[in-house]
Interface confidence: low
């Protein structure tokens, strides 16, 4: 029968006695830079070519005996899954193997840096098709390593790294914390992050999407019709490089961007276990298993979102916090969180000639985190319009002024230190068109964008009293693209987008008490684009 | 705490020294920083990447290398250069002592030194 | 739950005029757009014009300009329509409508139960 | 100033007909086209906005379609409570202004 890790990852309309989805990365080359392999095993025969690339140190200690089989273990395995005959995912992608990891499975910074310039210049000598990296590999937070690959990234190539088996934040880890690439944790058969030995699968912001990571069936390097169970980061990884290449071999033209956001898209949602994650870490850590789209005709018409996090802030006052979208995202609205709930808003500026999300910290507050959300929406002619706070006693308010931008966001922004004991009147953010509307003393900021065929709709959901979280979500076919709270009284932790809901965090209700101010509102913008959904019809 | 780069992790250390007067200072007297990793055994001391500013071309990443070996050698230090990086960033990758780091950091061009360290199979 | 309550029709001499006016609760009164909608027996809508409650910026059908004021009382979340130099022409129902702000487009997505305003000697 | 034509502007059908109403503007109103739904005696209901969005409510039998200048409101199955006067109205860009149809009685045959 079907191994469960690929039954995992394959859409219904596909399952049978065996995996066949259709096409099977033909049309991609996968790069694995990792330990020596076993080119001749027959899972991989023929698909991997191995290259004379090798940069890696020498082994520890004096005593250590090079055995082939076990320098080929890793490598072979990975390879297997990522484009194995019968255990792979990927079964159509051929595959360049580059050695960067010694036979103890360790490497250098140095050498991996080398090994990614050896990838590049390939690429500019003999340029192919779509091309995947993947790193089943970490080390600690390394600034030239991320930058390397975010230079691979913006050649256009797709980077796909483990988390790190580290039981431990992935932003601590390199090239796991490069923003550039696809960063995978690893989930087991129950959809639980996966436990290795007292440590286990890296969690947080992160982190892209898991995968399947725990018994995973594949190519031993012990004999060459040898199978063995391994599990890691690497593993889960290696899945996600599969499921890229059968994403780009059906559609070769992807960008990464458009590529990440169909992975997160098409996985399995809210299906781990978060509590075991740690509790500060659980909004920020993905609950996304890897799938495969359930066809191989893209999804163009859809309208793609995603949230960003930032890192967090630190507790000075005017400490502040940035999240940011890829060069080819729109940043379509921004929001903050703070665990103690002290914080001074967030705001949309350009930076760098791009819109960022920017959180404020309060005095007396452990922090703020900004949240971006960030979409596909090519054509966009996105701005931010921004209204100083209201004289007048009612309200601040902006609105999107010209003709054909909608409202994709709200933001707002007070410099007083807590606005919610000033218990004012807030306003719901219609009204007028386009518009958005706060608390007097708050700076408003709208994201007002126009693309062809963007139309957009506010969904709120009230609770009357004071509930530690509230949700409002959009209906099938529509994305949230803005997630805010309503009122902002001082009870409310921040808004976040979780998927398609927009979720409002308040505080303990036991600490705050239930007050008629209490009621906390959800607002969430849902749009869609029947632009891109009329030229995938055309398409087909 | 962590910054907005998400930078928190490592050890930036700005070496500021008197004017070598054998090395030209930085460009618009930005001074160059050094990164090592955070998790001290997986450091590897004594082998450097030296990360050039953004437009340095393949025969400046050269020239700033032999700069480094030359003005090395005067202080009598030996110096390797291992790799010189070009394609994706412009750079050299060095065997030297730590002892250089303050030299190293004035030479023209470059944006900041990291220390090798350690990746794993995961 | 989103209500309006019209109320102020009835029976007037042609030549005079009337106040209408529309009672809005269940929401926040200043946030949202309202129109005032007339219908005559047996015919289509017609629009008046409509007010930002929260600043008190109007626009009228070119019809009605100078015929029709329409105003607003924040304090009593009401809306309020003036009729001058009434006709038979202008007998019809008279409806306030909310202005609903569907992100991108525009829609009046409650109506009062409108109120009958007969204009006869 | 642009004019809304309904067509027909009254028709006659059975419970589980299919029943299609156009609404031709006289210049482009882009997507900004609702349609209304009014009994007798009563207010008008809002059914669709932005062309094609259902209102929150309105059963899924109802469908709106079109751009620019043409435009259908579709009733896939008829329902006995779905005999009424259907009212498309469009916003005019030029006068700032609010535009409605002239109306559709659909009636029982």
């Known amino acids: 029968s079907i191994p469960w890790n690929l039954e995992r990852i394959t859409p219904p309309r596909y399952r049978a006695d065996e995996y066949q989805p259709p096409d099977g990365g033909s049309l991609v080359e996968v790069y694995l830079l990792d330990t020596s392999i076993q080119s001749g095993h027959r899972e991989i025969e023929g698909r991997v070519m191995v290259t004379d690339f090798e940069n890696v140190p020498e082994e520890d200690g004096t005593r250590f005996h090079r055995q082939a089989s076990k320098c080929d273990s890793h490598g072979t395995h990975l390879a297997g899954v990522v484009s194995g005959r019968d255990a792979g995912v990927a079964k159509g992608a051929s595959m360049r193997s580059l050695r960067v990891l010694n036979c103890q499975g360790k490497g250098t910074v140095s050498g991996t840096l080398i090994g990614l310039e050896f990838i590049r210049k390939s690429q500019l000598v003999q340029p192919v098709g779509p091309l995947v990296v993947l790193l089943p590999l970490a080390g600690g937070y390394s600034r030239v390593l991320n930058a390397a690959c975010q230079r691979l990234a913006r050649a256009g190539v797709v980077l796909v790294t483990a988390a790190g088996n580290f039981r431990d934040d992935a932003c601590l880890y390199s090239p796991a914390s490069a923003p550039e690439v696809i960063t995978v944790g690893a989930t087991n058969a129950q959809d639980q992050p996966v436990t290795l030995g007292t440590l286990g699968t890296n969690f947080g912001r992160c982190v892209d999407l898991f995968a399947p990571g725990e018994d995973i069936i594949g190519a031993s390097s012990d004999c060459s019709t040898c199978y063995v169970s391994q599990s890691g980061t690497s593993q889960a990884a290696a899945h996600v490089a599969g499921i890229a290449a059968m994403m780009l071999s059906a559609e070769p033209e992807l960008t990464l961007a458009e590529l990440r956001q169909r992975l997160i898209h098409f996985s399995a949602k809210d299906v781990i276990n978060e509590a075991w994650f740690p509790e500060d870490q659980r909004v920020l850590t993905p609950n996304l298993v890897a799938a495969l789209p359930p066809s191989t005709h893209g999804a163009g018409w859809q309208l793609f979102c995603r949230t960003v996090w930032s890192a967090h802030s630190g507790p000075t006052r005017m400490a502040t916090a940035v999240a940011r979208c890829a060069p080819d995202e729109e940043l379509l609205s921004c929001s903050s969180f703070s665990r103690s709930g002290k914080r001074r808003g967030e705001r949309m500026e350009a930076q760098g000639g791009k819109l960022v999300c920017r959180a404020h910290n309060a005095f007396g507050g452990e922090g703020v985190y900004a949240i971006a959300r960030c979409c596909l929406l090519p054509q966009a002619n996105c701005s931010v319009h921004t209204a100083p706070p209201a004289e007048a006693s009612m309200g601040t308010r902006v609105h999107c002024h010209q003709q054909g931008h909608v409202l994709t966001g709200c933001s707002s922004h007070w410099e007083v230190e807590d606005l919610g004991t000033h218990k004012p009147p807030v306003l719901r953010p219609r009204g007028q068109p386009n518009q958005c509307v706060g608390h007097r003393e708050a700076s408003i900021h709208a994201s007002c964008c126009h693309a062809p065929g963007l139309e957009c709709k506010v969904k709120e959901h009230g609770i009357p009293a004071p509930q530690e979280q509230v949700t409002v979500a959009c209906e099938e076919g529509w994305t949230l693209t803005g997630c805010s709270a309503l009122p902002g009284t001082s009870h409310v932790l921040g808004a976040y987008a979780v998927d398609n809901t927009c979720v409002v965090r308040s505080r303990d209700v036991s600490t705050t008490g239930s007050t008629s101010e209490g009621a906390v509102t959800a607002v969430a913008i849902c749009c869609r684009s029947r632009h891109l959904a009329q030229a995938s019809q055309e398409l087909q | 705490q962590e910054d907005e780069d998400g930078d928190y992790e490592e050890l930036v250390l700005a070496l500021r020294s008197e004017e070598d007067g054998l090395a030209e200072a930085p460009e618009h007297g930005t001074t160059a920083t050094f990164h090592r990793c955070a998790k001290d055994p997986w450091r590897l001391p004594g082998t450097y990447v030296v990360v050039l500013k953004e437009e340095t071309h393949l025969s400046q990443s050269e020239r700033t290398a032999r700069r480094l070996q030359a003005q090395a050698a005067r202080r009598g230090y030996l110096t390797k250069i291992l790799h010189v990086f070009h394609g994706l960033l412009p750079g050299f990758l060095v065997k030297m002592s730590g002892d250089l780091l303050e030299l190293a950091l004035k030479l023209p061009h470059v944006d900041y030194i990291e220390e090798d360290s350690s990746v794993f199979a995961q | 739950e989103v209500q309006l309550l019209e109320s102020g029709g009835g029976l007037v001499q042609p030549g005079g005029s009337l106040r209408l006016s529309c009672k809005a609760s269940?929401?926040?009164?200043?946030?949202?757009?309202m129109h005032w909608v007339r219908q005559a027996p047996g015919k289509g809508l017609e629009w008046i014009g409509r007010i930002d409650p929260y600043n008190g910026g109007t626009k009228y059908n070119e019809k009605f300009k100078g015929k029709a004021t329409i105003s607003r009382d924040n304090s009593k979340n009401t809306l309020y329509l003036q009729m001058n130099s009434l006709r038979a022409e202008d007998t019809a129902v008279y409806y306030c409508?909310?202005?609903?702000?569907?992100?991108?487009?525009?829609?009046?997505?409650?109506w009062g139960q409108g109120t009958l305003v007969t204009v006869s000697s | 100033d642009i004019q809304m034509t309904q067509s027909p502007s009254s028709l006659s059908a059975s419970v589980g007909d299919r029943v299609t109403i156009t609404c031709r503007a006289s210049?482009?109103?882009?997507?900004?086209l609702t349609w209304y739904q009014q009994k007798p005696g009563k207010a008008p209901k809002l059914l669709i906005y932005a062309a094609s969005s259902l209102q929150s409510g309105v059963p899924s039998r109802f469908s709106g379609s079109g751009s620019g200048t043409d435009f259908t409101l579709t009733i896939s199955s008829l329902q006995p409570e779905d005999f009424a006067t259907y009212y498309c109205q469009a916003y005019d860009y030029s006068l700032s202004g609010y535009v409605f149809g002239g109306g559709t009685k659909v009636e029982i045959k």
């Open positions: 409508a909310r202005y609903g702000y569907y992100l991108g487009s525009y829609a009046m997505d409650y």
């Open positions: 210049q482009d109103v882009s997507r900004y």
């Open positions: 269940g929401y926040t009164f200043s946030s949202y757009w």
